[in-house]
Interface confidence: medium
């Protein structure tokens, strides 16, 4: 068992021109936080692979706020070492998988945006217990440096922490009853003693008594972080009186840069120039492919035609961004209007609206009467931005959508008796009452109130019959009316419907663009 | 009549969580959705989200994501408000109010409920 | 989000005059603002709905105007019960958004 410690130094725009002035974006104020994932062995690893030794991740850093027109300047960093603890044997070789990531602190439509900045991806050979390994990768435009190392965590020790070791206060033999005890070492290989006071943050030893400084910090304790304008500088000169370890004389001697790379001396250190598609202090690193599963969430890996972009990812639906890191929220767009409630179904999304909205996005106002409000034959009336069915005989409620008793109003006048009928009810009145509704009264000296009737009309007159007939026309008149009236509007449902499956078909793509 | 009963206060330790209620009554609870409406000391109305209480549907301002989590009890005609990791920023007057059925958002309002969070 | 920019914040009347308060979207909000009365003791109170819509049992001495981003609130002939705080809102899209309030008191 032990621990993979890794240590970010700095993290910054590369050199050269085009290089980014701010992690942020234009939205505002963000702060950077690392991921490290360990796979085991140097073979190219499944896209998709776990990071089957460990990973970790580190705190946020704090926040950076762009200054305009100051140059950009190293990025405030998290604090501490980022540890990914193994439990069984160091396999000597992995594959160290860095990601920057930018956690974007605007105005953003569901909280914080998160977002990779740069994944770096070293495969190395590393003993455990052996020193700080210092490193300078560089991913597109960005450029990172960090030390990193393996630990035994005693009574594990050794170059894979699989040989273990008694303490030396411990006993020879194990008790009585218990199984015999795993082969030990006759001694714990005790670490050496740093020089009192030297930080365990920041500082190392390999012999007793010494107090050697990760990269970017000095002074005898190691406490003291070194200035942005020596060694951390993103393009100044290493200088190793700050407690930098740079390499030695002719550092241009044997050229130290793979895959073609040229090599420039700068004051005390040398710099590469990579070819398209590698880069890191030595351009030994070629640029993110498919082989490192750049890809979250299921993303489709395609290798990019663009030589300076290695890959493309393709998202599901539901995720966006260059790696399909960002889980759209798609409801989070509010694409539903007047308040209708929004359902993420995955491969659809769909508004539940509020009464008095319909559509896809309930854009549609049915209180302006201009959708289907009113079932049933009802009429819509409108009035102050509300509306109002006049419901056909029979029906009643908001919508015209509940069946009413034609006879529960009390309709027939003047204690005349209601009966129900299929297109509405029918009133027969007491004597000395007649029309539609009994409203009319019959007068003493026979003639009736009725306006508008031919003069002498009785109700005992053989033309009563006509009147009869008349009205039974009219009701004929109606219900055909009705009828009518309720095929128009299937009919303009029909068309609304597929105008509203149009809509929203157009509404998922534009919400998957 | 329609009625909406919240309780009148609530005192929390920072860092905890406080589960409010509003019990309706009066109307049909099913049928009309429910609001949360947040207002902070001397400030304005914010607000926080509605619920369906047919299926427990509900619409989030993005500002309480991951702070408000709105539930109902069908059984008991309430819906509840859970605040979380609980700060003094979260020390308001929280609201129910009930969604009319037309196009009017919010027509009847619950006394409010007054969250103070101090350790 | 839309921003709804209640004004004034203040103002000070007598029984009797007439009053307006305005809100203003920051985008087109069509019909959809309502007003609402707070007043201490009581439940805030739905006046307006849909820009212009009375509240069914609000007095008709409160009326809505205004669509798209300008609207206001007018109260005429003032009764003793009206001096009490309003906030107008949007109900057109979510969040819904209120606006910062106006205190209205007696002269």
């Known amino acids: 068992a032990g621990v993979f410690e890794l240590q970010i130094h700095s993290f910054g725009p590369g050199p050269g021109p085009g290089a980014p002035r701010s992690p942020c974006s234009a939205r505002g104020p963000c702060r950077l936080f690392f991921r490290v994932c360990l796979k085991p062995g140097l073979s190219e690893e499944a896209a998709e692979s776990p990071c089957a030794l460990g990973a970790a991740l580190s705190a946020r850093g704090p926040v950076y706020t762009e200054q305009p027109e100051a140059p950009a300047p190293d990025l405030p960093l998290p604090n501490g070492l980022l540890q990914v603890p193994f439990r069984d044997a160091w396999p000597g070789t992995f594959s160290l998988i860095i990601e920057t990531w930018r956690e974007e602190l605007g105005d953003q439509i569901g909280g914080p945006a998160w977002s990779l900045l740069a994944r770096v991806t070293r495969r190395r050979r590393l003993a455990a217990g052996g020193p700080w390994a210092r490193d300078i990768q560089r991913a597109g435009a960005w450029e990172l440096r960090f030390s990193y190392r393996a630990r035994c965590e005693l009574p594990a020790v050794g170059t894979a922490c699989t040989r273990l070791c008694r303490p030396r206060s411990a006993p020879s033999r194990c008790g009585p009853g218990l199984r015999p005890c795993a082969p030990l070492e006759d001694e714990c290989e005790a670490p050496p003693v740093c020089r009192a006071g030297c930080s365990l943050e920041h500082g190392f030893c390999e012999q007793p008594g010494e107090c050697r400084c990760l990269e970017g910090w000095t002074g005898p304790l190691c406490m003291v972080p070194v200035s942005t304008s020596s060694c951390l500088g993103l393009r100044g000169p290493s200088s190793t009186t700050t407690g930098c370890l740079v390499p030695g004389p002719g550092p241009c001697d044997g050229n130290p840069c793979a895959n073609g790379g040229s090599c420039s001396e700068t004051p005390g250190s040398f710099e590469c120039t990579c070819p398209r598609g590698f880069y890191g202090l030595r351009c030994e690193v070629s640029g993110v492919t498919c082989a490192d599963g750049p890809c979250f969430n299921g993303g489709l890996c395609v290798g990019g035609a663009d030589p300076d972009s290695a890959y493309i990812c393709h998202c599901p639906p539901g995720f966006q961004g260059s790696n399909c890191e960002k889980r759209v929220d798609r409801c989070s767009l509010q694409p539903c209007r007047n308040g209708g409630l929004c359902l993420d179904l995955g491969h659809a999304l769909r508004c539940r609206c509020r009464a008095g909205f319909a559509g896809p996005r309930c854009e549609h106002d049915l209180d302006d009467c201009a959708g289907r409000a009113c079932a049933n034959g009802g009429t819509c009336v409108e009035g102050g931005g509300a509306h109002r069915c006049s419901c056909a005989l029979g029906f009643g409620g908001r919508n015209c959508r509940e069946r009413a008793d034609p006879c529960a109003a009390r309709p027939c006048a003047h204690g005349g008796r209601c009966y129900a009928h299929f297109s509405g009810l029918v009133c027969a009145c007491a004597p000395g009452y007649m029309g539609a509704r009994c409203e009319f009264p019959v007068h003493p000296d026979g003639v009736s109130a009725l306006p508008a009737a031919p003069p002498g009309l009785r109700p005992g007159d053989p033309q009563r019959a006509g009147v009869i007939a008349v009205i039974v026309v009219v009701v004929i008149a109606i219900v055909a009316g009705i009828v009518v009236l309720v095929i128009s509007r299937k009919k303009r449902m029909a068309k609304y419907e597929k105008a509203e499956i149009k809509e929203m078909g157009e509404m998922h793509r534009e919400l998957n663009a | 009549q329609v009625q909406l009963q919240q309780p009148g206060a609530e005192l929390v330790r920072p860092g905890t969580s406080v589960k409010l209620s509003c019990k309706a009554s009066?109307?049909?609870?099913?049928?009309?959705?429910m609001h949360w409406v947040k207002q902070r000391p001397g400030q304005g109305l914010e607000w926080i989200g509605v619920i369906d209480p047919s299926d427990s549907l509900a619409n989030y301002n993005q500002e309480f994501k991951g702070k408000a989590t709105l539930t109902v009890d069908t059984s008991s005609s309430t819906a509840y408000m859970q605040l979380s990791s609980l700060t003094s920023e979260d020390s308001a007057v929280y609201y129910c109010?009930?969604?009319?059925?037309?196009?009017?958002?919010?027509?009847?309002w619950g006394q409010g409920t007054s969250v103070t969070v101090s350790s | 989000d839309v921003q709804i920019t209640q004004s004034p914040s203040y103002l000070a009347a007598s029984p009797g005059e007439t009053i307006t308060i305005n809100c203003r979207a920051s985008t087109s909000i069509s019909k959809y603002l309502a007003w609402y009365q707070e007043r201490p003791g009581k439940t805030n109170k739905l006046l307006i709905y849909?820009?212009?819509t009375l509240q069914s049992g609000i007095p008709s001495r409160f009326r809505g105007s205004g669509s798209g981003t300008d609207f206001t609130l007018t109260i005429s002939s003032l009764e003793p019960e009206d001096f009490a705080m309003y906030y107008c809102?949007?109900?057109?899209?979510?969040?819904?958004?209120f606006g910062g309030g106006t205190k209205l008191e007696i002269k």
């Open positions: 849909s820009g212009s």
């Open positions: 009066g109307y049909t609870f099913t049928s009309y959705w």
């Open positions: 109010a009930r969604d009319s059925t037309v196009v009017a958002p919010m027509d009847y």
């Open positions: 809102q949007q109900h057109h899209v979510y969040p819904y958004t």
